[in-house]
Amino acid sequence: REPTVQCGSETGPSPEWMLQHDLIPGDLRDLRVEPVTTSVATGDYSILMNVSWVLRADASIRLLKATKICVTGKSNFQSYSCVRCNYTEAFQTQTRPSGGKWTFSYIGFPVELNTVYFIGAHNIPNANMNEDGPSMSVNFTSPGCLDHIMKYKKKCVKAGSLWDPNITACKKNEETVEVNFTTTPLGNRYMALIQHSTIIGFSQVFEPHQKKQTRASVVIPVTGDSEGATVQLTPYFPTCGSDCIRHKGTVVLCPQTGVPFPLDNNKSKPGGWLP
């Protein structure tokens, strides 16, 4: 029978670490991490790490009992967890019977938004207490709410990942800019900034009709030339506060009275701010 892995949590040092080993298995040949999605009961989905590793093809894998994988996550707070993956059979060949290296994977470490993860793996038996053992490590940075997979997570939806404010902005005269945008039921307070290398105008927008989508309009006084300036719309939603996804548009000249407003070149542009 071909070896498979059975993985379980092991937060402390492996018991083999306390034993003296004449020889230890070789290091891993490759270690990779990629995110995968799994559905959860709430109708949402969770993002997990698919950690895969490749064993070196030589006789040292005959000593191999397990591979231990530890993940450290750094964001607002630090997390640390480890799993030990035991091999169910002794290795009878250095490569898979069908060809190629022995490759295994573990899916289980949860992935939070916008977090840098350090994933380390080593084979067991590992090095003796005062020796450096072979190990491999990789970094993995999880995406934020603008990611095409993440944006459908409930946390991201509540932060406005699916909201398109369809910002339009035009220079009415030298002193004012008119900004129009579609509101969202997610919140009722917004901040509109006009930037042309520096901030030349801003306005708080309070939209009392929170429960339905409406088209809001605000006229903002400016202190400089506004044509070609950037409009930045910052929403304030309960779930993300002042750290919600921001949207951008560009100021153009207002059309003459009776001429339709030019929407085409003022599409909302996602900014780089993530919850």
Epitope: D22, L23, G26, A57, D58, A59, S60, R62, L63, Q92, T93, Q94, T95, R96, P97, S98, G99, G100, K101
Partner: antibody
Framework: EVQLVQSGAEVKKPGASVKVSCKTS????????MNWVRQAPGQGLEWMGR????????QYNQKFKDRVTLTRDTSISTAYMELSRLRSDDTAVYYC???????????WGQGTLVTVSS | DIQMTQSPSSLSASVGDRVTITCRTS??????LAWYQQKPGKAPKLLLY???NLGDGVPSRFSGSGSGTDYTLTISSLQPEDFATYYC?????????FGGGTKVEIK
């Protein structure tokens, strides 16, 4: 029946290169590493390197690392060993040898005599 | 690299004799050792692997033993076709090395 059939004898001048082929049959080519071993006249056996036909991973004996190139063509189940900058002490019989479950050499080619002489 | 020391380098024996060849390694190779037989002008032939397992079609008069750093090839009753050179080889991870060989000659 597993067979490894090597190309014929070669005579080369110092500084030249030689490429030896090893055509295999009777087993799944990508499932076993292929090793190359040489034997100088009246001498012992010397491992040169190995290639995994599945993904072309190669491991060399440091002694030959700068001069030997191992390749393979999976479409014709053939492995190749090229040795460059030949010297007179490279005169030897060169063998391809297929690994077993681990790197014992279960099957050998018949050998290719490479003579380096000016 | 792991060094392989084979002894004796040559020996003379008669048909029917029991012959023993030893191979010592510079470090523990956990029985990852093979033995080969080579006749003049021919490729080597696998006799034993994993120190004790017979290769395909190898007569049972050949046997292997040992562990750690010391290994032995034994031919229980030498036959005429056994006069050849014998090599040990470790396969405990590259680079693989061979013993210097033992030539078994007719007494």
């Amino acid at each position: 029946e597993v067979q490894l059939v090597q190309s014929g004898a070669e005579v080369k001048k110092p500084g030249a290169s030689v490429k030896v082929s090893c055509k295999t049959s009777g087993y799944t080519f990508i499932s076993y590493w292929m090793n190359w071993v040489r034997q100088a006249p009246g001498q012992g056996l010397e491992w040169m390197g190995r290639i995994d036909p599945y993904d072309s991973e190669i491991q060399y004996n440091q002694k030959f690392k700068d001069r030997v190139t191992l390749t393979r063509d999976t479409s014709i189940s053939t492995a190749y060993m090229e040795l460059s900058r030949l010297r007179s002490d490279d005169t030897a019989v060169y063998y391809c040898a297929r690994s077993g479950g681990f790197d014992w050499f279960a099957y050998w080619g018949q050998g290719t005599l490479v003579t380096v002489s000016s | 690299d792991i060094q392989m020391t084979q002894s004796p380098s040559s020996l003379s024996a008669s048909v029917g004799d029991r012959v023993t060849i030893t191979c010592r390694t510079s470090e523990n190779i956990y029985s990852n050792l093979a033995w080969y037989q080579q006749k003049p002008g021919k490729a080597p032939k696998l006799l034993l692997y994993d120190a004790t397992n017979l290769g395909d079609g190898v007569p049972s008069r050949f046997s292997g033993s040992g562990s750690g750093t010391d290994y032995t090839l034994t031919i229980s009753s030498l036959q005429p076709e056994d006069f050849a050179t014998y090599y040990c080889q470790h396969f405990w991870g590259p680079p693989y090395t061979f013993g210097g060989g033992t030539k078994v000659e007719i007494k």
